[in-house]
Interface confidence: low
């Protein structure tokens, strides 16, 4: 695989993407949630565009909720909401994002959460990702499955 | 409109103490870490201290650390820096920043400072 | 003294392109820390021209550029316009978490 190496990282995270996504990418992201955690917010850039933002959000009025969106000549599209919320404050995760042809498919500790159609479709030009919120960062990295 | 404005800038005695604010408003306070920063009479930026939306993740340079506490208040939309013991060399306008996941940590929204003199 | 290290000056005549360079370490700019640079006109508040090493923020113009090799950072200007005469920071983070700034580099429009 290829990232950052084991242990703490400083959040915000920047993992270089060189090349892009391509289908069969697999990007692992370990890490721990701070306890009282407000939010984790996983951005794929390209350029000053998100293609794929992935925002769990832990009291949003009251309720815990995952947010995915786009964000496009500095606007944010539709949003699309997700109720599953597998993360716990204080707890260890695995977040895996596997690229596929025309959606991200996201999977947390080990099981299945969300797929994300792709609306920015060069894949080759989201050289980045963005990794901010309230976690303690272990490793992120990626590899072709 | 995304706002941040500091106040408590004041000339103090060596010694001495202050609190600056910074009342930040048009965006939600509470997601985003925060920033001081100052800037020494014609001199360059120096970082001070951070602390993120949730007040668990707190940093300080190395100059300021056991003399200046960084705080928030997100009910408030407020941003506080106690200073203690001040010297003649911490005389500069503080800026009070925000750093932005969406903008990769960059600071990307600045008050407009407030001036801190220190003098006997 | 500043840990990022920037040329004190430059200077271009209009049109013509310059670049500014921020040279640190391993632990700053060289690790997957983010680089950002600033726009600082006299009397004013800094301004971010360039986050995450090479993007721009919406409303800042494509003449300005960042590129990141090893350890050491670059922002390009193109096109030089008399309104670009201002100081520019540099800014990482480093690894033990805090930030840390260059001296500021003053770009003088000849």
């Known amino acids: 695989p290829y990232g950052a190496p084991a242990g703490p990282l400083i959040v915000p995270y920047n993992l270089p993407l060189p090349g892009g996504v391509v289908p069969r990418m697999l990007i692992t992201i370990l890490g721990t949630v701070k306890p009282n955690a407000n939010r984790i917010a996983l951005d794929f850039q390209r350029g000053n565009d998100v293609a794929f933002h992935f925002n769990p959000r832990f009291n949003e009025n009251n309720r815990r909720v995952i947010v995915c969106n786009t964000k496009l000549d500095n606007n944010w599209g539709r949003e699309e909401r997700q109720s599953v919320f597998p993360f716990e404050s204080g707890k260890p995760f695995k977040i895996q994002v596997l690229v596929e042809p025309d959606h991200f498919k996201v999977a947390v500790n080990d099981a299945h959460l969300l797929q994300y159609n792709h609306r920015v479709k060069k894949l080759n030009e989201i050289s980045k990702l963005g990794i901010s919120g309230d976690i303690d960062l272990t490793s992120a990295s990626y590899t072709m499955i | 409109e995304v706002q941040l404005v500091e106040s408590g800038g004041s000339l103090v005695k060596p010694g001495g103490s202050l609190r600056l604010s910074c009342a930040a408003s048009?965006?939600?306070?509470?997601?985003?870490?925060m920033n001081w920063v100052r800037q020494a009479p014609g001199k360059g930026l120096e970082w001070i201290s951070s602390i993120d939306g949730s007040s668990r993740s707190i940093y300080y340079a190395d100059f300021v650390k056991g003399r200046f506490t960084i705080s928030r208040d997100n009910a408030k939309n407020s941003l506080y820096l106690q200073m203690n013991s001040l010297r003649a060399e911490d005389t500069a306008v503080y800026y009070c920043?925000?750093?932005?996941?969406?903008?990769?940590?960059?600071?990307?929204?600045w008050g407009r400072g407030t001036l801190v003199t220190v003098s006997s | 003294q500043s840990v990022l290290t920037q040329p004190a000056s430059v200077s271009g005549s209009p049109g013509q392109s310059i670049t500014i360079s921020c040279a640190g370490t391993?632990?700053?700019?060289?690790?997957?820390?983010?680089v950002a640079w600033y726009q600082q006109h006299p009397g004013k508040a800094p301004k971010l021209m360039i986050y995450s090493d090479s993007y721009r923020p919406s409303g800042v113009s494509n003449r300005f550029s960042g590129s990141k090799s090893g350890n050491t950072a670059s922002l390009t200007i193109s096109g030089l316009q008399a309104e670009d005469e201002a100081d520019y920071y540099c800014s990482s983070y480093t690894s033990n978490s805090a930030r840390v700034f260059g001296g500021g580099t003053k770009l003088e429009i000849k």
């Open positions: 391993s632990s700053d700019v060289g690790g997957s820390y983010n």
């Open positions: 048009g965006f939600t306070f509470s997601n985003d870490d």
């Open positions: 920043v925000r750093s932005s996941g969406y903008s990769g940590g960059g600071m990307d929204v």
